[in-house]
């Protein structure tokens, strides 16, 4: 089958090869699309409600005045010329719609080095097929889940038009001492080939470097963070700064739904409590500061508990991995 791509809302003419240029003609068109159940046969005589969707022109071609998503599918024409020779035409029609220029909304004017920040949300409206959004830093593609980059994507389909709205939220952790004015942009790549990407206007947030603070210490009891089922682990976040900052807790990188406190008690430890814990100290005059991370694990009876593990920096270090 010959592949045809047509823009939604535009007219489309499909030639019926081998058909006499004018009536009388012996030809029929068969359609299997989103509008049909199995095959629909159209003849030059036409008439009826299908004429508004597709009709056979005097030269035997099939004319669709405004293609829609439901017109995607297979179109076949079988024609016989004056000498009785049969010719078949076979088309696979796919439709597309180029969305408006994507936009970055809720963009941050300032990012804090060393901690995750939301850069902004890229929105593309009115595409078909869905296509993809990708982010760029200083013109180079950003790879999610690499070097502190994370992307949350959402695809919605309009209930009436069937067109897609894409959303992509970018989170980055700028490196300390890095570029003070990075340039972020987002581009939409269509789902059908041969159409160029559409790029947003760039944004240039400032990167704020927090004044180095004395390190937040995370103390684990029992040391090493390995405990028998049903035991208790106490995590204490020690911050030398005055006045005392607010301290919140994270598990596996996600904030825990708890009021601020420098102490986190995990009583009656069960499997669901295993994971990586850290505390975040928020100072009124500085940005948030995350402690090293420790891993809490369960020692099954008969296992030897590890001695103190080691971690460095504020990345996700590990302690006592069972």
């Amino acid at each position: 089958a010959q592949n045809i791509t047509a823009r939604i809302g535009e007219p489309l003419v499909l030639k019926c090869k081998g058909a006499p240029k004018k009536p009388p003609q012996r030809l029929e068109w068969k359609l299997n699309t989103g509008r049909t159940e199995a095959w629909k046969v159209l003849s030059p005589q036409g008439g009826g409600p299908w004429d508004s969707v597709a009709r056979v022109l005097p030269n035997g071609s099939l004319f669709l005045p405004a293609v829609g998503i439901q017109d995607e599918g297979i179109f076949r024409c079988q024609a016989m010329n004056r000498n009785g020779k049969e010719t078949k035409s076979n088309y696979r029609v796919r439709v597309y719609q180029i969305p408006g220029k994507p936009e970055i909304v809720d963009s941050a004017s300032e990012l804090t080095a060393g901690v995750p920040n939301k850069v902004g949300t890229c929105v593309s409206e009115g595409s078909y097929p869905a296509g993809t959004l990708s982010w760029h830093l200083d013109g180079k593609p950003l790879v999610p889940n690499e070097k502190g980059v994370s992307v949350k994507e959402q695809t919605r389909r309009h209930p009436e038009t069937g067109l897609f709205t894409l959303q992509s939220e970018l989170m980055v952790t700028p490196a300390r001492g890095g570029d003070p004015r990075p340039t972020f942009s987002c581009s939409f790549s269509p789902g059908l080939p041969r159409h160029r990407a559409l790029r947003t206007a760039p944004i240039q947030p400032r990167v704020w470097e927090p004044v180095p603070l004395e390190e937040v210490q995370l103390v684990v009891e029992p040391e090493g963070g390995a405990v028998a089922p049903g035991g208790t682990v106490t995590l204490t976040c020690e911050v030398p700064a005055q006045p005392s900052p607010q301290i919140h807790w994270m598990k596996d990188g996600v904030p825990l739904p708890l009021p601020p406190s420098p102490v986190l008690i995990l009583p009656e430890i069960g499997p669901q409590d295993q994971g990586t814990y850290s505390c975040v100290a928020t100072h009124s005059s500085h940005g948030p500061q995350e402690s090293r991370a420790v891993s809490i694990s369960i020692i099954e009876p008969g296992e030897e508990g590890p001695t103190a593990g080691s971690v460095g920096g504020s990345g996700l270090g590990t302690l006592a991995l069972a």
């Epitope: 825990l256 739904p257 009021p259 601020p260 406190s261």
Partner: antibody
Framework: EIQLQQTGPELVKPGASVKISCKAS????????MVWVKQSHGKSLEWIGT????????SYNLKFKGKATLTVDKSSSTANMQLNSLTSEDSAVYYC??????????WGQGTSVTVSS | QAVVTQESALTTSPGETVTLTCRSS?????????ANWVQEKPDHLFTGLIG???NRAPGVPARFSGSLIGDKAALTITGAQTEDEAIYFC??????????FGGGTKLTVL
Amino acid sequence: EIQLQQTGPELVKPGASVKISCKASGYSFTDYIMVWVKQSHGKSLEWIGTINPYYGSTSYNLKFKGKATLTVDKSSSTANMQLNSLTSEDSAVYYCARLRLYAMDYWGQGTSVTVSS
Amino acid sequence: QAVVTQESALTTSPGETVTLTCRSSTGAVTTSNYANWVQEKPDHLFTGLIGGTNNRAPGVPARFSGSLIGDKAALTITGAQTEDEAIYFCALWYSNHFWVFGGGTKLTVL
């Protein structure tokens, strides 16, 4: 057996205050966070706030900031909630619930507060 | 503020499997919303069933399970029993330090 025992029903006048208590037993009181929840008649539940009994720190739903004050008495393993400047909008059943990291596992039986002149 | 939506009522038969869902107005529910499911029986009797999306509370029967289905949190009762007739509330946590409850689903077991 783990229990959260709340004080009995209260009938109070508009403008007055009321203090509801929730006595915990069967577990180490300071090891678990306490959540307070409001259930207005025929309505869903609303989170009022959360208190850490070990440290005394609180988080409030902005809607209830100034309306509710959460405290604890560690010596009696009791969490308290004071509601002030009461109006008919505050007539509801109030619950305490134990929060273990992220799970509201045990609930009190509720305290009914009726504000009426 | 976020709005959390549940089915207002569902009916099932003893032994059947039934799934209740919980949708967030802010987008897909994720594990970082720490979905909780709470059961209310007559006389204001509340019991926590599920916390943190899929962790059963102590003493809760294994027929209750929590999960994420598509962009919603879900509570599945596998082999419903007549004593499971109750109102079920879900609660989601939002990272601006906020718990929000759904309107509750009245489950009838006929």
